[in-house]
């Protein structure tokens, strides 16, 4: 049975139970490009953060360039959420618990500011993909995932013809794409700059707040 | 959903100055490149200006040396200072944003630039 993020009594400055993530966040100074707003406080290592900037990384053998080559004004957005994912000890209200042979937790719903997704599907318009959800259904043979049968590689707009259905279907409902905009403290940010600090503690506050979790 | 929300605009003697404005709402306005453009009655769409979200320029021939792009990415703003205007510079102008490598689809209502001589 699945475990709500009730059940969790940690919902503040957590890390997910999952493949890479450290058990504790903590200071990480070395942490890569992208992943460098977090170096304050991390789920991920210096590492960790150096291999998911790489084409096909060893993180998960996932390749983005399934479908040729991807711009790298889209790519840059799958990196940013992977730094999310891997580095944010600010998820926790979100945190569910998985049956799965790679990690035992999972993030769900998590409130994307809008701003974020819309930016996301707008730089992948031009670029391709197969699936709709990346979650499941590729061909793994020969280690790195492949097109299925019978998937044929389109325009993103094609597999999702709107924001929402990127940012919420891509990740199995990873996100769900928040009415709120960024700055309000209401909505968690993938992209920010880390000189103001890291504006997702604040909302990771309210929600926890709003769940009746110390 | 994106908007832009272009003003400023109005009528100025020949040699005069004008600064247009652009407001962007809806993407994450830092990341992109940002332009101005201009459409005189019975001619095409054309770029003026352009600047990287790095803030790199780029000016068509007939402007260089007159107008000033620039941005406040705090205010998600983009600016056009127009100088020793000129009656051929009489357009409705527009801005748009730039995502990866296209301008985008998304429109203002723009904003009536008249130049009288």
């Known amino acids: 049975t699945m475990c709500s993020a009730q059940d969790r009594t940690d919902l503040l400055n957590v890390c997910m139970d999952a493949k890479h993530h450290k058990t504790k966040p903590g200071p990480e100074d070395k942490l890569h490009d992208q992943c460098s707003p977090w170096k304050k406080n991390a789920c991920c290592t210096a590492s960790t953060s150096q291999e998911l900037h790489k084409d096909t990384s060893r993180l998960y053998n996932f390749n983005w360039d399934h479908c040729g080559k991807m711009e790298p004004a889209c790519k840059r957005h799958f990196i940013q959420d992977t730094c999310l994912y891997e580095c944010s000890p600010n998820l926790g209200p979100w945190i569910q618990q998985v049956n799965q042979s790679w990690r035992k937790e999972r993030f769900l719903d998590v409130p994307l500011c809008k701003e974020d997704c819309q930016q996301w599907w707008e730089d992948c318009h031009t670029s391709h993909t197969c699936k709709s959800n990346w979650h499941r259904g590729w061909d793994w043979t020969s280690g790195v995932n492949k097109c299925p049968a019978g998937a044929l590689c389109r325009t993103f707009e094609s597999y999702f013809p709107t924001p929402a259905a990127l940012c919420e279907g891509l990740w199995s409902h990873s996100y769900k794409v928040s009415n709120y905009s960024r700055g309000s403290g209401r909505c968690i940010q993938m992209w920010f700059d880390s000189a103001q600090g890291n504006p997702n503690e604040e909302v990771a506050r309210f929600y926890a707040a709003a769940m009746h979790v110390n | 959903q994106v908007q832009l929300q272009e003003s400023g605009g109005g009528l100025v003697q020949a040699g005069g100055s004008l600064r247009v404005s652009c407001a962007a709402s809806g993407i994450i306005f830092s990341m992109n490149g940002m332009g101005w453009f201009r459409q005189a009655p019975g001619k095409q769409r054309e770029l003026v200006a352009s600047?990287?979200?790095?803030?790199?320029?780029k000016y068509a021939d007939s402007v260089k040396g007159r107008f000033t792009i620039s941005r406040d990415n705090a205010k998600n703003t983009v600016y056009l200072q127009m100088n020793s205007l000129k009656p051929e510079d009489t357009a409705v102008y527009y801005c748009n944003i730039q995502f990866g490598s296209r301008w985008s689809t998304y429109w203002g209502q723009g904003t009536q630039v008249t130049v009288s001589s």
């Open positions: 600047i990287t979200s790095g803030g790199s320029t």
